[in-house]
């Protein structure tokens, strides 16, 4: 019988008492085969973290800073359940640390040196650790003691709880630096009052502070937020302009064998029986013998953290950067305006080889990082292990939902000023063999389908979106008799047609021979009835243009397109017979890397782009013999986006809506994780 006991870790007598009450009350409402609670008492949160890592306990609830400690080796714990605040309809699991300034003050984030600062308190998250962690490498050396470096960075501060004797500048705006509400500038409201009164130039608080202190929109409009990209935004745009997004209070467990499903089952049942306004005799979110025992008293319930989410993703790049800077205290030799090398994310073996050649030829401007799937690459860019990659529109959508931004677009048509004119897009088409003359868009049920990969634009999002509108369910593996859609579940009928060997079968990378545009067309040639690809795929792989044995004797005339009106047309008539227009592939990166990625890629394409005529000995960035490695092989240049610099603007309203509709059918664990951070 599987052990269904969750060993909860308590850090004080009062917590242990509440834990025992939790255990007893759960016993009274949960059947004997359901989850149960056992209590383990430790002296501190760090001891609890170690106990869970050592399998002496299973769960504890932690503040963000401790979630970071729990994640570090050798602990390797992960977030499994989040407390939420506010209402069930609009649950808040995170708050945003922000830098608030007066509207007319005219300076940016990179101009804070010499300004006067207001902090909630020394060592507090939004008021100190996050802003000072992010500013750490701009502080004057020596950076230890930290208080002295901060005092020398700002021209005056109020940092309640600081030592006013040793660091008088930190108490200059609030004599004495009192560590309670007796100090009018203490805490969130106090730090904001310090700014409001004109004592300070910037207040480091959380996003809700300004709303709690200024009920009137006209008053709030006198303030702005400083963004990390050295711009400003209105105070209600905190989701797009903050220093960090911070989880409030989180249950952690072991990454391996951590009982995360059992913990959720327990807490979900606990909130049903003993959550807000549920029971008189025991309340999960109440602490009669103290404050915030086991869970925060202000919590309203629990939400399951998506399984794909590790602590780094949960805490977010900015928060991890800030805390790491403070803990490790390491900075680059001397901050320069030079761009660091761009770490390109390469999918599996073949892309890695091309990336390595690029790295060698770039003489250090490009470095390479590998991942097995596109989603793994996106996750690596999110957490700073990689910086950039070029993505199909479907993945631009996921990357955008995960906070990444498009920076340059692939262009496929030769034009005089290619780099200045991003194209409208390419056409997503459905290709069939001419010989299968009875096949139309209206009778695809039961046929064999070939897709570039799950989640990609021409191969999946567009055709499956159209199909979903017809069949109103997500069981595409039942609609087609079999197929190859790399990235599907291995036991799905949509992996049956794939050709990869062993573990590579149906993998969404080049180890699966039927992956990508060329792969999906090959699948049609060898096994399938219909291939969902781009309009250039057939001409690029017929007439001897692809020398591979399977393709070298193919003729474009042997293939036709399915039109949405039930007719068929020759391949060259794609403009009048396509499923939809697809946004071009685009390079994505983190916001903080946008300028450098843009600059370095433009240099790189001038050296290795379409202007290179002989690719037999020279490195060519946009060539890989029909394999579309790193970039599509038909890329002519990477074009500026001008004002289309967010994923919504880049993809366009219509496509975003189409993918949004298909979200119900999404199997993307990354998309689930990212929408948890930003619904």
């Amino acid at each position: 019988v599987p052990d269904k006991t969750v060993r909860w870790c308590a850090v004080s007598e009062h917590e242990a008492t509440k834990c025992q009450s939790f255990r007893d009350h759960m016993k009274s409402v949960i059947p004997s085969d359901g989850p149960s609670v056992a209590c383990v008492k430790k002296a501190s949160y760090l001891d609890c973290i170690r106990a869970i890592a050592a399998n002496e306990a299973d769960a504890v609830t932690l503040d963000a800073g401790l979630v970071y400690d729990a994640y570090l080796a050798p602990n390797n714990l992960k977030p499994v359940v989040a407390e939420f605040y506010g209402s069930k309809e609009d649950p808040q699991t995170f708050y945003y640390a922000v830098a608030v300034v007066k509207k007319d003050s005219g300076f940016q984030m990179n101009q804070l040196r010499g300004k006067k600062s207001c902090h909630t308190g020394l060592g507090r998250s939004a008021g100190w650790n996050i802003p000072i962690g992010l500013l750490y490498c701009d502080l004057p050396e020596p950076r230890k003691p930290l208080e002295k470096a901060v005092a020398n960075f700002f021209s005056g501060s109020c940092a309640p709880c600081a030592d006013g004797t040793d660091f008088p500048q930190l108490c200059q705006l609030c004599p004495g630096c009192g560590c309670s509400t007796l100090n009018q500038y203490f805490g969130y409201s106090g730090a904001f009052k310090c700014l409001k009164d004109g004592a300070g130039d910037v207040a480091f608080v959380k996003h809700s502070t300004i709303f709690e202190n200024l009920a009137n929109k006209a008053d709030r409009d006198q303030y702005e937020l400083l963004c990390l990209d050295n711009t400003r935004k209105p105070v209600d745009e905190y989701k797009d302009c903050h220093l960090a997004q911070v989880p409030s209070h989180t249950v952690v467990a072991r990454s391996m064998g951590g009982k995360e499903d059992l913990i959720w089952e327990l807490l979900n049942q606990a909130q049903e029986h003993f959550g807000k306004d549920k029971s008189k005799e025991f309340q999960l979110f109440s602490s009669p013998h103290g404050k915030d025992l086991l869970f925060k008293d202000s919590a309203h319930g629990f939400l399951k953290v998506p399984p794909r989410m590790d602590a780094k993703m949960y805490l977010g790049y900015e928060y991890v950067t800030a805390i790491r800077n403070l803990r490790e205290g390491t900075c680059p030799e001397a901050p320069t305006d030079e761009c660091k090398p761009v770490k390109w994310c390469a999918l599996s073996h073949h892309e890695r080889l091309k990336c390595d050649e690029w790295s060698v030829n770039s003489v250090g401007k490009i470095e390479c990082v590998s991942a097995e799937t596109t989603e793994d690459c996106i996750a690596k860019i999110m957490n700073g292990e990689a910086d950039a990659m070029s993505l199909d529109g479907g993945f631009v959508y996921i990357a955008g939902k995960c906070g990444l931004v498009p920076v340059l677009a692939e262009n496929y048509n030769k034009s005089d000023n290619c780099e200045d004119t991003p194209e409208a897009g390419y056409f997503a088409i459905a290709v069939v063999k001419k010989s299968a003359s009875d096949l139309t868009w209206d009778n695809l049920k039961g046929k064999k389908s070939c897709h570039t990969a799950v989640g990609r634009t021409a191969g999946w999002n567009i055709p499956m979106g159209l199909l979903y509108n017809k069949i109103n369910h997500c069981r595409f593996d039942e609609f087609f008799s079999e197929g190859c859609a790399p990235g599907s579940k291995k036991d799905s009928s949509l992996c049956k047609l794939c050709m990869g060997s062993g573990l590579n079968l149906c993998e969404p990378n080049n180890k699966e021979g039927y992956y990508g545009y060329t792969g999906a067309f090959r699948c049609l040639v060898e096994k399938g009835d219909v291939a969902f690809v781009k309009h250039q795929t057939v001409p690029q792989n017929t007439g001897g243009k692809n020398p591979d044995p399977w393709a070298k004797n193919l003729n474009e005339k042997d293939y036709e397109l399915l039109c949405l009106d039930g007719t068929r047309k020759p391949v060259e008539e794609y403009a009048n017979c396509h499923l939809a227009r697809a946004p071009n592939h685009a390079v994505v990166t983190r916001k903080d890397k946008e300028a450098c990625v843009h600059k370095i890629l433009r240099q790189q394409q001038h050296l290795f782009g379409s202007n290179v005529t002989d690719c037999s000995g020279n490195f060519c960035l946009f060539r890989s013999e029909t394999k579309d490695l790193l970039f599509r092989d038909d890329t002519v240049c990477l074009a500026k986006l001008h004002d289309r610099n967010t994923y919504e603007k880049y993809l366009g309203e219509e496509y975003v809506k189409a993918v949004g509709n298909l979200r119900k059918c999404s199997t993307s664990s990354l998309l689930e994780a990212c929408t948890f951070r930003r619904p």
Epitope: E351, E357, S616, G617
Partner: nanobody, 117 residues
């Protein structure tokens, strides 16, 4: 058909030196970017160093200042001079010719370098 034959590996003490060679035939050696890779037991393949047709070189951080890549186009041979060897340099070393464009995998049999006292 491209053929790459690596040689020069062996057992060496920490702090010692070795010079690896890679003879290429059937390759457009003189105009290709060439590189040395290595694979330690139980680990993935990693780029050690590369050299372009014009002689520009690139090294992974852990070997910078200790290893030197060079090429002799007249002999169709690539070299890797390895000094101040460390235990973590133990691996099978392979050379590759990128002219094959990444997906016709041309790899030699490799040459084993063991750094141990």
């Amino acid at each position: 058909e491209v053929q790459l034959v690596e040689s020069g590996g062996g057992l060496v003490q920490p702090g010692g030196s070795l010079r690896l060679s890679c003879a290429a035939s059937g390759s457009i050696f003189s105009i290709a970017t060439m590189a040395w890779y290595r694979q330690a037991p139980g680990k993935g393949l990693e780029l050690v160093s590369g050299i372009t047709r014009s002689g520009s070189t690139n090294y992974r951080d852990s070997v910078k200042g200790r290893f030197t890549i060079s090429r002799d186009n007249s002999k169709n041979t690539l070299y890797l001079q390895m000094n101040s060897l460390r235990a973590e340099d133990t691996a099978v070393y392979y050379c590759t010719d990128y002219s094959s464009r990444y997906y016709h995998d041309y790899w030699g049999q490799g040459t084993l370098v063991t750094v141990s006292s």
